[in-house]
C-alpha cells in the first residue's frame, strides 16, 4: 500500500487537526528544550508543506519520507548546538541513522521546571482568548516532559482538557468544577506516560518478541473467548502501532491505531462481548476505551491444559515444528484461564515451560522428564502472591505515607548509590500500589499490583540508565524483563556500600517548611529519611521510626511557634544531635 507522497497520505487520513497535533508532539518530544513558539512555527511550516502535497503529490520533495522531512525541519533550528550539544551531530547523519540518533537523545528526566498551575480565572481567560494556542501549549508542555508519551492518547487527553475548560469556565464555581478534573488528568497522564514507557523499553531493550509475548498474555486475559488466531492478529497489529510510536513515527502510529480500533469494532463477535459501548464513541475516545476495556468472561467449558501441554506424547513434536507458535498458544491458553495472574507471572510461567521443553525434549524419555512441569510453576505463583499479601498487610497497618516510608528505607538499603530524588520518586510511586490495588478483591490484586510495580521499576531502570551508579540496579534492569520485580525484591542490604558522611546542611530545616503543601512536606521528610539511611544503612526500622516521629513532632512544634525561624534554628540542632545519638 505505497503512496506517492507519504506526508499527503497521512494528512488526508488523519485530518488537519490531528496531523498538526501529532507533529507538534513529535517535535516537542525530540527537541525538549525548544520554546513553544519555535515549535509552533515548525509545525505550521510542515503543515503548509503537507497541504501543497495533498494538492499535488508530485510536487517537489513530496516523495520524501516523513523522517527525512521532519529531520530536515528539526535541523533548521538555529540554536541546536548551543541548546542540545552533541545532539546537533545527529544532523550530519543520513536517514535512518539520523532518526535513531534523535531517539537516543530523548531525555527521560529533562531539566525543566515543574508545571505551575495558574489561578483558575487566569487559565479561563487564556482558554477563551485563544483556545487553539492554549491546547497546543498543553500538548507541548506534556510532550516535552514525557518524550515517550503515547501520542494518539495524548490527543485524547488534550480533548478532555479542552472539555474540562469549556464546561468549567462557564460554571458558577469555576475552581470547584475545574481543579478536580485537572488533578485527575494530571494523575492519569503520569500513569499513562509510565505505562507507555515500559512498552517502549520492552520493544527497544528486549525486542519485539518480548513485547509480543506481553501482548499475547494481556490480550488473552482481556479476550478469553477469542480464538488464538484472532489474538495473534491483534498482537501483530498492536506491536506495529507501538513500535511506530516508540520509534517516533507518530503519524503512522496514530493512523494504524485508528485502523486497529476500526477492525476491532467490525469484528466484535470474534473478539469480546465488552467492546459494544466503546465502539459507539468518537475515534480518540473509542481507542482509549478499547485499550482500557475490562476482561470478558471466561468461556465456561475450558478443558484442562495438561492434556495438550503435559500428557500428550506429541508435546516435543509440536514444539519442534514451530517453537514460538507452540509457546504462544501455551501462553494464550494459560492467560485466558488466569485473569487472576499478573502478566509478568504468566510470562515467567511460559519461560519456565520453554526451559523445561528445551531440556526435556533432548532427554532420553522426554515425557517422563516434563511430566511434572506444572508442579514447578507452584513456587513461581506463590512468590508474587506472598509479596502482595505481605505488602498489603503492611499498607493496611501503616497507611500510604508511612508505607511509602517503609519502601524508602527498603530500597535505600538495597541500592543506596541511587540518587536521593530518584529513590524518593520511585518509592513514593511504589507506595501508591497500596491504595490502588490492596482494596481490590483477591482475584484482581496480583495483576493490579505486580503489573503496576513493573511500570514503576521501569522508571527506576530508565533513570538509572541515564546515570548508572549501581551494578545491582543494572543487573536487575537488563538481565530479564519479566524477572525485574523479583530481582529487586530479592536484593538484600548492600554490604559493600560505604555509608555517606554526615552533612549537617542536609538535615537543616527552615520556616519555609511550614508553608509547603502536605505533599511537598512529605517529600522533604522523605528526602531526609533517605539521607539518614544513606548515612546509617544498618539502622533498624524501630530506630528510624523513632527518628521520623521526632522529626514530625519537631516540625509541628516549630510551625506552631510565633517565631518559626528562631524555633527551627534552636530546635533543629537538638533534633539532629538526638537523632545521631539514637542511631549510634
Amino acid at each position: 500500500d505505497t503512496h506517492k507522497s507519504e506526508v499527503a497520505h497521512r494528512f488526508k487520513d488523519l485530518g488537519e487537526e490531528h496531523f498538526k497535533g501529532l507533529v507538534l508532539v513529535a517535535f516537542s518530544q525530540y527537541l525538549q528544550q525548544c520554546p513553544f513558539e519555535e515549535h509552533v512555527k515548525l509545525v505550521n511550516e510542515v503543515t503548509e508543506f503537507a497541504k501543497t502535497c495533498v494538492a499535488d503529490e508530485s510536487a517537489e520533495n513530496c516523495d520524501k519520507s516523513l523522517h527525512t522531512l521532519f529531520g530536515d525541519k528539526l535541523c533548521t533550528v538555529a540554536t541546536l548546538r548551543e541548546t542540545y550539544g552533541e545532539m546537533a551531530d545527529c544532523c550530519a547523519k543520513q536517514e535512518p541513522e539520523r532518526n535513531e540518533c534523535f531517539l537516543q537523545h530523548k531525555d527521560d528526566n529533562p531539566n525543566l521546571p515543574p508545571l505551575v498551575r495558574p489561578e483558575v480565572d487566569v487559565m479561563c481567560t487564556a482558554f477563551h482568548d485563544n483556545e487553539a494556542t492554549f491546547l497546543k501549549k498543553y500538548l507541548y508542555e506534556v510532550a516535552r516532559r514525557h518524550p515517550y508519551f503515547y501520542a494518539p492518547e495524548l490527543l485524547f487527553f488534550a480533548a478532555r482538557y479542552k472539555a474540562a475548560f469549556a464546561e468549567c469556565c462557564q460554571a458558577a464555581d469555576k475552581a470547584a468544577c475545574l481543579l478536580p478534573k485537572l488533578d485527575e488528568l494530571r494523575d492519569e497522564g503520569k500513569a499513562s506516560s509510565a505505562k507507555q514507557r515500559l512498552k517502549c523499553a520492552s520493544l527497544q531493550k528486549f525486542g519485539d518478541r518480548a513485547f509480543k509475548a506481553w501482548a499475547v498474555a494481556r490480550l488473552s486475559q482481556k479476550f478469553p473467548k477469542a480464538e488464538f488466531a484472532e489474538v495473534s492478529k491483534l498482537v501483530t497489529d498492536l506491536t506495529k502501532v507501538h513500535t511506530e510510536c516508540c520509534h517516533g513515527d507518530l503519524l503512522e502510529c496514530a493512523d494504524d491505531r485508528a485502523d486497529l480500533a476500526k477492525y476491532m469494532c467490525e469484528n466484535q463477535d470474534s473478539i469480546s462481548s465488552k467492546l459494544k459501548e466503546c465502539c459507539d464513541k468518537p475515534l480518540l475516545e473509542k481507542s482509549h476505551c478499547l485499550a482500557e476495556v475490562e476482561n470478558d468472561e471466561m468461556p465456561a467449558d475450558l478443558p484442562s491444559l495438561a492434556a495438550d501441554y503435559v500428557e500428550s506424547k506429541d508435546v516435543c513434536k509440536n514444539y519442534a515444528e514451530a517453537k514460538d507458535v507452540f509457546l504462544g498458544m501455551f501462553l494464550y491458553e494459560y492467560a485466558r484461564r488466569h485473569p487472576d495472574y499478573s502478566v509478568m507471572l504468566l510470562l515467567r510461567l511460559a519461560k519456565a515451560y520453554e526451559a523445561t521443553l528445551e531440556k526435556c525434549c533432548a532427554a532420553a524419555d522426554p515425557h517422563e522428564c516434563y511430566a511434572k512441569v506444572f508442579d514447578e510453576f507452584q513456587p513461581l505463583v506463590e512468590e508474587p502472591q506472598n509479596l502482595v499479601k505481605q505488602n498489603c498487610e503492611l499498607f493496611e497497618q501503616l497507611g500510604e505515607y508511612k508505607f511509602q516510608n517503609a519502601l524508602l528505607v527498603r530500597y535505600t538499603k538495597k541500592v543506596p548509590q541511587v540518587s536521593t530524588p530518584t529513590l524518593v520518586e520511585v518509592s513514593r510511586n511504589l507506595g501508591k500500589v497500596g491504595a490502588k490495588c490492596c482494596k481490590l478483591p483477591e482475584a484482581k490484586r496480583m495483576p493490579c499490583a505486580e503489573d503496576y510495580l513493573s511500570v514503576v521499576l521501569n522508571r527506576l531502570c530508565v533513570l538509572h540508565e541515564k546515570t548508572p551508579v549501581s551494578e545491582k540496579v543494572t543487573k536487575c534492569c537488563t538481565e530479564s524483563l519479566v524477572n525485574r520485580r523479583p530481582c529487586f525484591s530479592a536484593l538484600e542490604l548492600d554490604e559493600a556500600y560505604v555509608p555517606k558522611a554526615f552533612n549537617a546542611e542536609t538535615f537543616t530545616f527552615h520556616a519555609d517548611m511550614c508553608t509547603l503543601s502536605e505533599k511537598e512536606k512529605q517529600v522533604k521528610k522523605q528526602t531526609a529519611l533517605v539521607e539518614l539511611v544513606k548515612h546509617k544503612p544498618k539502622a533498624t526500622k524501630e530506630q528510624l521510626k523513632g527518628v521520623m516521629d521526632n522529626f514530625a513532632a519537631f516540625v509541628e512544634k516549630c510551625c506552631k511557634a510565633d517565631d518559626k525561624e528562631a524555633c527551627f534554628a534552636e530546635e533543629g540542632p537538638k533534633f539532629v544531635a538526638a537523632s545521631q545519638a539514637a542511631l549510634a
Partner: nanobody, 124 residues
Framework: QVQLVESGGGLVQPGGSLRLSCAAS????????MGWFRQPPGKEREFVAS????????YYADSVKGRFTISRDNAKNTGYLQMSSLKPEDTAVYYC?????????????????WGRGTQVTVSS
C-alpha cells in the same frame, strides 16, 4: 530491645528430625514477626521460614516446604522451627530474627533483632 536466644540444634542423621526454639525477652513478643534464617558453611545467609505476629500467616523457602514447620507461642514468648526429613544440605547455623513490622518478610535486612545462632549438622 529484644533479646533472642536459639536452642535445640545438634547433630542428626539424614532423614531425622530436630526442633529449634527461639526464646524472646525484653519487649512484647506478640508485636513482632519471627523469622528463621540459616547460613550454610561458606555460603550467604538465606531465608528459611517466617511467621507473622498473630501466627496466622507462615512463609517457607522452596527448599524446606513440606519438611519444616514454623510456629509460635506468644504466651511463652517463644518461636519454634520443627525440622523433619533432614538432608545433609540443611547443615548450617540457624538464626532466629524478629521483625517489628509484624509481617514476616523474606529479606534478612527487614529484621531488627537477631539471635546468635544454633548449629545444625546433618550427617551420617
Amino acid at each position: 530491645q529484644v533479646q533472642l536466644v536459639e536452642s535445640g540444634g545438634g547433630l542428626v542423621q539424614p532423614g531425622g528430625s530436630l526442633r529449634l526454639s527461639c526464646a524472646a525477652s525484653g519487649r512484647i513478643f506478640s508485636t513482632y514477626a519471627m523469622g528463621w534464617f540459616r547460613q550454610p558453611p561458606g555460603k550467604e545467609r538465606e531465608f528459611v521460614a517466617s511467621i507473622n505476629r498473630s501466627g496466622d500467616s507462615t512463609y517457607y523457602a522452596d527448599s524446606v516446604k513440606g519438611r519444616f514447620t514454623i510456629s509460635r507461642d506468644n504466651a511463652k514468648n517463644t518461636g519454634y522451627l520443627q525440622m523433619s526429613s533432614l538432608k545433609p544440605e540443611d547443615t548450617a547455623v540457624y538464626y532466629c530474627a524478629a521483625d517489628s513490622d509484624g509481617i514476616g518478610w523474606f529479606n534478612s535486612f527487614e529484621y531488627d533483632y537477631w539471635g546468635r545462632g544454633t548449629q545444625v549438622t546433618v550427617s551420617s
